[in-house]
Every structure is written in structure tokens, then in C-alpha cells.
């Protein structure tokens, strides 16, 4: 070994030369939180790049860049030494016009305490350990809920847009015609029943079981749907959005109000599978893989 | 292909009455917000002569208001458009409009949905 690299060695396996790095990256974090930072800190800045510079030119010398098996860059927590690094130097000294774009780059820094304390490298290797393991059931979820996002599309494409319309209209208007003019928030007051509070129009249905409309109002298939368009079974991906929503449980009662009211209560059933497999079932097991992970990495 | 069945046209004298029948009576038909009567003249426009909403209530164009009445038989899902008192003026094409909501099997569709059109003519 060549005196440098000897000198290289005790530097990276001295405790102060941790403590060096926690408290620059500590340091680091603090000053990224000030709002609007003084000029001097720019300098600051530099001290920071300097020494992550040094830390990295020390684990370079003491193991080598890439070629051998233990060298820098085999090592995963280097990626980000080296990405952090790299994106200071961009950062400061090339002009790439937009540069606010990668200064976001810079809270990778904070990442960089995961790699300096072993409790939260072991847990952080734990966490990656059970993404690798919840693939399984990660490919089962989303097989279960393209399965349920199709029947959904079958069963309620374009219901959620029936709404109650109003049965009195001028000489010259048609449904069609004022399909074609909806545009602002007002017309579509001016046309729908809405219930007092509430954003989007009375939902109905045309088979029994289904909401019905007021006096005066008739339900018809016209204009966008709830939540400004965002709840729907019209296509895939939103029945399988809406399906991943009554998985997590997010506001769900409100969508089976929804699809209950437009398309008939005998599709309570549809709701009641969904929720037992995809929400009890799946996420439980989901969390069971998660526990197991994290017990193989503790022993 | 959703088909209204219109019937009841002719040649009448003035003074005369006819009546006019639109059959939605196929089972696309779900449900409407009115059927109507309109009709259209030689040279003039498609005018709206009188419709029916689903809850019974009806609109009239005043030049017919008095003397055309409308009405609907919900079973068996047809309007008729009785014509009193017939002028040279009422000569025209006398169309039947479903405006309301159809069924394609696979979903709803809602709009307007027209007929083939009847022929009224008014002379001596």
C-alpha cells in the first residue's frame, strides 16, 4: 500500500472522521431550511461540497474507484456520495439555464445521513429487503384489482354521468342542444338538480333500484362526471383508480354512494368483495410480507 | 338503429282535423325529458309545433296554441298531436322528436333521436 493510501485507510476508519461527516450533513440539513438565506452561506455551501469532496476522495484512495470488489463505487451508499457530489459541481460551475430543477438535487444530502448511521442503514435495508419480497404480492394485488376494474368497467361505464335534468325548457332547446353548450358552472345549475351544498349534480339511475329524480327533473346521461371528472368507471385505468381507492379505503363510501345511487343497490354485493378481498384481505397481506422482511433482517 | 314510427299524415281541407301518432314502442326507448312535434314548411325552417314532457306538462307554438293539443299514452309509449282547425299554413313535414334517453345494450345514450317525418297537406 503507498503512504497515501495508508493515510486514506485511518482517516476512513477513525470514529471522528464519522462524526466529521454527520455533523456537516446535520449542518447541511439545518441551513437547506432557511428560507431566505444571507450571502455568506453561498460560501458555506462551498465548505459543504468541499468536504463531501474530501470524504469521497478519502473512500477512493482507501478502496479504489470501480475495478475491484469492495472498491467505491460497488458499494450502493456511494452511488449517492458520488450523485451528490456530481450535482453540487453542475450546480455551481456549469450554466444549464433552468437551474432550480437541480437544485432540488441538493436534499439528496439528506439522504446521505442514512448511510453514516448503521441503525438507519440496517432499517433502510430492511424496507428494500421487503420491496424486493412484496413483488409476489404486489403482482397479485394489481392482477386482483385489473380483474374488479374490469368488471367495474362492464358494469358501470357512463353511469356516474346520469344525472336529474330539468323537465321545462325554452322553444327553441333540445337535450342535444344544450349538451352542446354546457360549459360553465352556472349552466350546468342552470339545467341539474343539485342537492343544497353539494358541487356536483343529483346522480340518478334508470332501473328501480336506482336514485330517482325529484319532481320536475328526468334522469338523463349528459355532461361530465363527479368530482370534476375525476370518479368514473368509463375507462380502465379510472375503474382501476377508483378500485385502488376502495382498496386504501380512501373516501370510499362516498364513490359507493355514488355508483349505488346511478346504477341499483344489487351492486352493493360488487362493494361488499371488493372490500373484504381487496382491502381486509390484500393489504393485510401486504403487511404480513412487510413483518416477515423486517424480522429475517433483524435476525 | 333506434326507429320512431310516425303516422296519421294526409291532405285535409282547411277547417279539417287530423291525427298525428309517433310510436317509440322499441325497447331502446328508455326513458325521455319530452317527444315533441316539429314540423317543417317549404323554404322555412324546422319549427317546434308542440311537445309533451314525461310528467304530462306541454309546450305549444303560438301560431298552433288552441288548436293542436298534445297528448301521450305512457303504455304504449306513444304521443299523438290531435290538429283542429287546419290552415293552408300548417302545410308541412311533420317530424316526431324523442329527446331523452335510449338504451345501446351496452349503455345508455342520451339525446336527440328523430323521425323519418310524416306529410301533412292542407288544401282545397
Known amino acids: 500500500f503507498s503512504p497515501l493510501r495508508r493515510i486514506s485507510i485511518k482517516i476512513l476508519v477513525h470514529s471522528l472522521f464519522s462524526m466529521l461527516i454527520m455533523c456537516t450533513i446535520l449542518t447541511n440539513c439545518i441551513f437547506m431550511t432557511m428560507n431566505n438565506p444571507p450571502d455568506w452561506t453561498k460560501n458555506v455551501e462551498y465548505t459543504f461540497t468541499g468536504i463531501y469532496t474530501f470524504e469521497s476522495l478519502v473512500k477512493i484512495l482507501a478502496r479504489g474507484f470501480c475495478v475491484g470488489e469492495f472498491t467505491f463505487l460497488r458499494d450502493p451508499w456511494n452511488w449517492l456520495d458520488f450523485v451528490v457530489i456530481v450535482f453540487a459541481y453542475l450546480t455551481e460551475f456549469v450554466n444549464l439555464g433552468n437551474v432550480s430543477a437541480l437544485r432540488t438535487f441538493r436534499v439528496l444530502r439528506a439522504l446521505k445521513t442514512i448511510s453514516v448511521i448503521p441503525g438507519l442503514k440496517t432499517i433502510v435495508g430492511a424496507l428494500i429487503q421487503s420491496v424486493k419480497k412484496l413483488s409476489d404480492v404486489m403482482i397479485l394485488t394489481v392482477f386482483c384489482l385489473s380483474v374488479f376494474a374490469l368488471i367495474g368497467l362492464q358494469l358501470f361505464m357512463g353511469n356516474l354521468k346520469h344525472k336529474c335534468f330539468r323537465n321545462s325548457l325554452e322553444n327553441n332547446e333540445t337535450l342535444e342542444s344544450i349538451m352542446n353548450t354546457l360549459e360553465s358552472e352556472e349552466d350546468f345549475r342552470k339545467y341539474f338538480y343539485y342537492l343544497e351544498g353539494s358541487k356536483d349534480a343529483l346522480l340518478c339511475g334508470f332501473s328501480t333500484d336506482s336514485g330517482q329524480c325529484p319532481e320536475g327533473y328526468t334522469c338523463v346521461k349528459i355532461g361530465r362526471n363527479p368530482d370534476y371528472g375525476y370518479t368514473s368507471f368509463d375507462t380502465f385505468s379510472w375503474a382501476f383508480l377508483a378500485l385502488f381507492r376502495l382498496m386504501t379505503q380512501d373516501y370510499w363510501e362516498n364513490l359507493y354512494q355514488q355508483t349505488l345511487r346511478a346504477a341499483g343497490k344489487t351492486y352493493m354485493i360488487f362493494f361488499v368483495v371488493v372490500i373484504f378481498l381487496g382491502s381486509f384481505y390484500l393489504i393485510n397481506l401486504i403487511l404480513a410480507v412487510v413483518a416477515m422482511a423486517y424480522e429475517e433482517q433483524n435476525q | 338503429e333506434v326507429q320512431l314510427v310516425e303516422s296519421g299524415g294526409g291532405v285535409v281541407q282547411p277547417g279539417g282535423s287530423l291525427r298525428l301518432s309517433c310510436a317509440a314502442s322499441?325497447?331502446?326507448?328508455?326513458?325521455?325529458?319530452?317527444t315533441g312535434w316539429y314540423r317543417r314548411a317549404p323554404g322555412k325552417q324546422r319549427e317546434l309545433v308542440a311537445r309533451?314532457?314525461?310528467?304530462?306538462?306541454?309546450n305549444y307554438a303560438d301560431s298552433v296554441k288552441g288548436r293542436f293539443t298534445i297528448s301521450r299514452d305512457n303504455a304504449k309509449k306513444t304521443v299523438y298531436l290531435q290538429m283542429n282547425s287546419l290552415r293552408p299554413e300548417d302545410t308541412a313535414l311533420y317530424y316526431c322528436?324523442?329527446?331523452?334517453?335510449?338504451?345501446?345494450?351496452?349503455?345508455?345514450?342520451?339525446?336527440?333521436?328523430w323521425g323519418q317525418g310524416t306529410l301533412v297537406t292542407v288544401s282545397s
Open positions: 322528436l324523442f329527446s331523452g334517453t335510449i338504451s345501446t345494450g351496452r349503455e345508455y345514450r342520451s339525446g336527440d333521436y
Open positions: 322499441s325497447r331502446q326507448f328508455i326513458r325521455d325529458v319530452f
Open positions: 309533451i314532457y314525461n310528467e304530462g306538462n306541454t
